[in-house]
Interface confidence: medium
C-alpha cells in the first residue's frame, strides 16, 4: 500500500482541532509582485518580509515596496514601511542580515538617476528601528559583513571601488580602486583582485590578488597573473595563468597567501573551469572541468594541505562555469555526499559516497519501489536523485534534496528508480540512515521541510492548482496526516520555516486571486500542540551511524571512528525542543587501508582497497611543488584521509624529501610578492 496508508499508521489524536487553534492567517495589503523573506537572528522569532511591485509606465518602471515585521515566527505581521520612509527597496540586493545574533539588517534603496550615491537603511535592533544613510558611492553588490565583527562591512561600487565601513555603514571609505572581486577572510582580513589596464573582463588572467589585514591601512600583493580566487575552509585558492600559454593552474595557501603551493591538479584551458564543491578545515572537493563543451569533469579530493589530490569521481556532471551541478553535502551524516555523473549514453545517474569521496556507489533501490523502464533489468536498478540540474532543466522537481545537521540521518529528495534519472514525474524518497537505505515517502512531487530536529516533517503537494491541504508526519515520513489549513485554496509559492530545523512553526506562502486583484497571504501553523510533551530519555534509542554489518567489530567505522547517536524513536510523538542538542558518542577505530587515500601517482582499481601505481608514472620520480620548492615523494601509495582519526592497525609509510630546487611553474613564489601602505 502507499506510504501513509498502512494499517499500523496511528492517527495523531485530535490533530485537526489542535492545529486549527494554532493556524494564523495574515493577508498582506499588497498587489502581488514579488515577496522575499528573511529571518533575523536565531530563535528570535523575528521575520522581515519585503514585497515589491513594479508598475511598468510608458517611459519608465515605477516600483513600490512594503516592509513587514513579525516577532512571533510569522503568526502576526506589522507594516513597518514607514520606518524606511516608504522608500522603494532594491530586491536584487535582498536584505543583508548580520551574522549570528547581531540583530543587524541593511536594506539598499532605489535612488533616482542623478544622485551622487546610493542609500541604505540600517538597523541594529532586529529591525525595530532603521537609520537612513546616504552613501558616497552606488553599490554594485550587497553589503558584506565580516564574519568576525558585524560592524565591519564591505561593498563594491559600480565604479569598481572597494568600500569599507568600520561602524556598521555609518561612514564609508574607499580603500582601493579597480577591484573585481572582494571577500572577507578570517580575522577581518579582506582579499581582493585588482585590474591594471582596462577592466575586470579584459584583464582576466592578468589580475593581481591583494590582501589587507587592517581594513585598508596597508596592503600586500599576494599573487599576480590571477584569473580568479576562492576561499574554502582554511584554504585560499587562486587560479593562475601559465607563463607560456593560455592554460591556468590552481595554487593553494594555508597561511592567508604568504606562501603558495601548486595544487597537483590538471591545468585547464580558456574554456574550462575549476570549482570548489565543498571545503572544510580538513580538505577540499575540487571539480576540474573536462576540455570541450562536455558538461562534465572530474572530482578530486585533497590532502590536509590542499596540495596533493586524488581522483575521486569521473564524469562528474557540471554544466558550465557557474552552471549546474548536483553535488550535495548530506549534512545529517558526516562523510556523506551525493552527486550526479553523466554516463556514456548521456543519461544522468546518481552516486553517493559515505567516506568523504573515497569511494562512490549507486544508491540502493528502495524496498517499496519497482524499477522504471530506464532499467535494463527490472530487478536490478538504483535510486536516482533530482537536484539542481533537474530543477534547471524545468523537470517537475520543486525542491532540491534536504538534510539538517540536527535531524540525524534524515535525507529527503525527489527521485526516480531505474538505470538513470528520469524525466517522468518524480516521487519523494526518504532515508533515515544518511543515504544507505531509502523508502518512497510521498507519491508525486512535493515541497517539504523538517521541523523540531526531525520530530515533524511537513509536505505540500506541488500543483499548478490552488491548494489548501498540508501533510505532516511525526514518524520520519512513514505515516502521513493531512490538515486543511484554509477553506479557500491559495496559489502556493513557498514553505518557510526558521533555518536550523529547530522550530515547530511553518509558514505557507501564496496568493489569492480574485477577479479584480491578487494579494499575498501567509498561513503560519504551530505544531507545538501536536507534540504535546517534551521528549524524555525513554523516547530515544541508540543508533550506530554507518552501520552495514553488525557482526563486524569495525562496523560503523568511517574516517577512523564510529559514532553512536541518541535518536528519537519513530513511535514517539514528543518535542525535541528548541534547545535539543544531538547526543553522540564517538569511538576510535583501528586503521585499515580504507583510512588511506591513494597518494599522488597512485590509484585504486575498482572494488579494490589497495593503491597501485599509475602506469604512466611507473618508474618515474614523483615530484611536486611545495611552497615554491620542488619536493621528491617517496611513498608506497597511501596517505591518511584528511580528518581520519584512526589509530594503530595498518600504517603505510610516506615520506617527502626536499629536493632544494625551485619550481619553475610556481608563479606565486614569495619573491614575487610585495607590500605597501596607504
Amino acid at each position: 500500500s502507499a506510504p501513509g496508508e498502512d494499517e499500523e499508521c496511528g492517527r495523531v489524536r485530535d490533530f485537526v482541532a489542535k492545529l486549527a487553534n494554532n493556524t494564523h492567517q495574515h493577508v498582506f495589503d499588497d498587489l502581488r509582485g514579488s515577496v522575499s523573506l528573511s529571518w533575523v537572528g536565531d530563535s528570535t522569532g523575528v521575520i522581515l518580509v519585503l514585497t515589491t511591485f513594479h508598475v511598468p509606465l510608458v517611459i519608465m518602471t515605477f516600483g513600490q515596496s512594503k516592509l513587514y515585521r513579525s516577532e512571533d515566527y510569522g503568526k502576526n505581521f506589522k507594516d513597518i514601511t514607514d520606518l524606511i520612509n516608504n522608500t522603494f527597496i532594491r530586491t536584487e540586493f535582498g536584505m543583508a542580515i548580520g551574522p549570528e545574533n547581531s540583530g543587524k539588517v541593511v536594506l539598499t534603496a532605489e535612488v533616482s538617476g542623478g544622485s551622487r550615491g546610493g542609500r541604505i537603511f540600517r538597523s541594529s535592533d532586529f529591525a525595530k528601528n532603521f537609520v537612513q544613510t546616504d552613501l558616497p558611492f552606488h553599490p554594485l553588490t550587497q553589503m558584506m559583513y565580516s564574519p568576525q565583527n558585524s560592524d565591519y562591512l564591505l561593498a563594491l561600487s559600480t565604479e569598481n571601488g572597494l568600500w569599507v565601513s568600520k561602524n556598521f555603514g555609518g561612514k564609508w571609505e574607499e580603500i582601493h580602486k579597480a577591484v573585481c572581486l572582494a571577500k572577507w577572510g578570517s580575522d577581518n582580513t579582506i582579499f581582493f583582485t585588482t585590474y591594471a589596464n582596462g577592466s575586470c573582463k579584459a584583464d582576466l588572467g592578468a589580475l593581481e590578488l591583494w590582501r589587507t589585514s587592517d581594513l585598508g591601512k596597508s596592503f600586500k600583493t599576494i599573487g599576480v597573473k590571477i584569473y580568479s580566487f576562492g576561499l574554502g575552509g582554511r584554504f585560499l585558492f587562486a587560479s593562475v595563468m601559465a607563463d607560456k600559454d593560455t592554460t591556468r593552474r590552481i595554487h593553494v595557501s594555508t597561511d592567508q597567501g604568504d606562501t603558495w603551493s601548486m595544487a597537483q591538479l590538471p591545468s585547464v584551458g580558456q574554456e574550462q573551469f575549476y570549482s570548489i564543491l565543498a571545503a572544510n578545515d580538513d580538505m577540499v572537493f575540487m571539480h576540474v572541468d573536462e576540455p570541450g563543451d562536455t558538461g562534465f569533469g572530474t572530482i578530486f579530493t585533497s590532502d590536509d594541505r590542499g596540495i596533493v589530490y586524488s581522483k575521486s569521481l569521473d564524469r562528474h556532471l557540471y554544466t558550465t562555469t557557474g552552471g549546474e551541478t548536483d553535488f550535495t553535502n548530506v549534512t545529517s551524516l558526516r562523510g556523506v555526499y551525493i552527486t550526479s555523473v553523466l554516463s556514456e549514453d548521456n543519461s544522468i545517474q546518481t552516486m553517493i559516497t559515505f567516506d568523504q569521496g573515497g569511494r562512490w556507489t549507486h544508491l540502493r533501490k528502495p524496498e517499496n519501489s519497482e524499477c522504471d523502464a530506464t532499467a535494463k533489468n527490472k530487478n536490478e536498478c538504483s535510486l536516482h536523485i533530482h537536484a539542481s540540474y533537474s530543477i534547471s532543466q524545468k523537470l517537475n522537481v520543486p525542491m532540491a534534496p534536504l538534510s539538517e545537521p540536527n535531524a540525524v540521518g534524515i535525507v529527503i529528495a525527489h527521485g526516480s528508480v531505474g538505470d538513470a534519472i528520469s524525466v517522468m514525474v518524480p516521487d519523494v524518497y526518504i532515508s533515515d540512515d544518511g543515504g544507505y537505505s531509502w523508502t518512497k515517502m510521498l507519491e508525486g512531487p512535493h515541497y517539504y521541510t523538517i521541523l523540531d530536529s526531525g520530530g515533524i516533517i511537513v509536505a505540500i503537494e506541488h500543483s499548478s492548482r490552488p491548494i489548501n491541504v498540508i501533510k505532516f508526519s511525526t514518524d520520519e515520513g512513514q505515516c502521513w496526516q493531512t490538515y486543511t489549513f484554509t477553506r479557500d485554496p491559495i496559489y502556493f509559492t513557498g514553505l518557510a520555516s526558521e533555518p536550523g530545523a529547530r522550530s515547530m512553526n511553518i509558514s505557507i506562502w501564496g496568493f489569492t486571486e480574485s477577479f479584480l486583484t491578487s494579494q499575498w497571504v501567509s498561513y503560519t501553523i504551530d505544531f507545538k500542540d501536536i507534540l504535546e510533551r517534551n521528549c524524555e530519555e525513554k523516547d530515544y534509542t541508540i543508533w550506530l551511524a554507518h552501520s552495514t554489518d553488525p557482526e563486524d567489530y569495525e562496523d560503523g567505522c568511517i574516517l577512523g571512528y564510529k559514532e553512536q547517536f541518541l535518536r528519537l524513536r519513530k513511535s514517539s510523538v514528543c518535542q525535541n525542543g528548541r534547545d535539543y542538542v544531538v547526543t553522540k558518542q564517538p569511538s576510535i577505530c583501528l586503521c585499515s587501508l580504507e583510512d588511506f587515500l591513494c597518494d599522488f601517482g597512485y590509484y585504486r582499481p575498482e572494488n579494490d582497497s589497495k593503491c597501485v601505481e599509475q602506469p604512466e608514472l611507473k618508474g618515474h620520480d614523483l615530484e611536486f611543488c611545495l611552497y615554491g620548492r620542488e619536493e621528491h615523494l617517496t611513498t608506497n601509495g597511501y596517505r591518511k584521509i584528511p580528518g581520519d582519526k584512526c589509530q594503530g592497525g595498518v600504517n603505510p609509510v610516506r615520506e617527502v624529501k626536499d629536493l632544494k630546487k625551485k619550481c619553475t611553474s610556481n608563479f606565486l613564489s614569495p619573491e614575487k610578492q610585495n607590500s605597501k601602505s596607504n
Epitope: 558538461g295 554544466t319 548521456n346 523502464a373 527490472k378 528508480v417 538513470a420 528520469s422 514525474v425
Partner: antibody, heavy 129, light 107 residues
Framework: QVQLVQSGAEVKKPGASVKVSCKAS????????MSWVRQAPGQGLEWMGI????????SYAQKFQGRVTMTRDTSTSTAYMELSSLRSEDTAVYYC??????????????????????WGQGTTVTVSS | EIVMTQSPATLSVSPGERATLSCRAS??????LAWYQQKPGQAPRLLIY???TRATGIPARFSGSGSGTEFTLTISSLQSEDFAVYYC?????????FGGGTKVEIK
C-alpha cells in the same frame, strides 16, 4: 514482427468513458514506454501521455489530467487508455505508440530521443448524443 | 509547455523537386526531435529521430538537420509516395508536443 494491435472502434455518449486497449507483440513489452496520441478529424497529432510498463507510473499532458488513466497488464503485454467524462470534442482516432527512449533525463548535450517508432493502427472513438 | 510551429502549412512541389520543411520550438529542445509522415487513413510513420538520424527503412532522400530551436526536414527529390502530411515532435520536456503539420501536395 513488432506490432501494436488496438481494439475496435467505439461510439459513446457524452459523459461516458471509453477504454482503448493496445496489445504489443514481437518485442519485450516491459523494455519500452508506451505513449498515447490522438488525432481529431482533420486536425494534427496531440500527445496525451506516457506509461512506464514496469512500474506502471504515468505522466499525462496537463489537458487530460484528471480524465485520463493509463494502465498496463504485463502478463498480456497490453496497454490501456481510459478517457472519462467524454465530450463531443473527444471524437478522434486514438493511437498507442512505442516510445523506446525510456525517459532518462538528458545530460547537457540533450537526451538522445529515438522517436515513437511503432504505432498501432488507431481506434476511432465517436462521441455523440 | 514547449510550442512547436511548422511552416509552411502547405507546400506545393513537383515530383523530382526538393522540399524543405521547417519546425521551430518555443524554447531549446536540444536534439530531442522527431519527424513523422502521415498519409490519409494511416497511422504516422517515424522518419527521423534525434533531429538528424534516419529511422530503419527510411530512404536516403529524407534528411533532418538543426538543433536547439530551429529544425529542417529535407526531401531531396520528391517521389509520388512522399506526398503526405509531415509532423515534427519534441521530447525535451513533458508534455511531448507536435507541430501543426505541413501538407506536401503535388504542384
Amino acid at each position: 514482427q513488432v506490432q501494436l494491435v488496438q481494439s475496435g472502434a467505439e461510439v459513446k455518449k457524452p459523459g461516458a468513458s471509453v477504454k482503448v486497449s493496445c496489445k504489443a507483440s514481437g518485442y519485450t513489452f516491459t523494455k519500452y514506454y508506451m505513449s498515447w496520441v490522438r488525432q481529431a478529424p482533420g486536425q494534427g497529432l496531440e500527445w496525451m501521455g506516457i506509461i512506464n510498463p514496469i512500474g506502471g507510473s504515468t505522466s499525462y499532458a496537463q489537458k487530460f489530467q484528471g480524465r485520463v488513466t493509463m494502465t498496463r497488464d504485463t502478463s498480456t503485454s497490453t496497454a490501456y487508455m481510459e478517457l472519462s467524462s467524454l465530450r463531443s470534442e473527444d471524437t478522434a482516432v486514438y493511437y498507442c505508440a512505442r516510445d523506446p527512449s525510456g525517459i532518462a533525463a538528458a545530460g547537457p548535450a540533450g537526451r538522445y530521443y529515438y522517436g515513437m517508432d511503432v504505432w498501432g493502427q488507431g481506434t476511432t472513438v465517436t462521441v455523440s448524443s | 509547455e514547449i510550442v512547436m510551429t511548422q511552416s509552411p502549412a502547405t507546400l506545393s512541389v513537383s515530383p523530382g523537386e526538393r522540399a524543405t520543411l521547417s519546425c521551430r520550438a518555443s524554447q531549446s529542445v536540444s536534439s530531442n526531435l522527431a519527424w513523422y509522415q502521415q498519409k490519409p487513413g494511416q497511422a504516422p510513420r517515424l522518419l527521423i529521430y534525434g533531429a538528424s538520424t534516419r529511422a530503419t527503412g527510411i530512404p536516403a532522400r529524407f534528411s533532418g538537420s538543426g538543433s536547439g530551436t530551429e529544425f529542417t526536414l529535407t526531401i531531396s527529390s520528391l517521389q509520388s509516395e512522399d506526398f503526405a502530411v509531415y509532423y515534427c515532435q519534441q521530447a525535451r520536456l513533458g508534455p511531448w508536443t507536435f507541430g501543426g503539420g505541413t501538407k506536401v501536395e503535388i504542384k
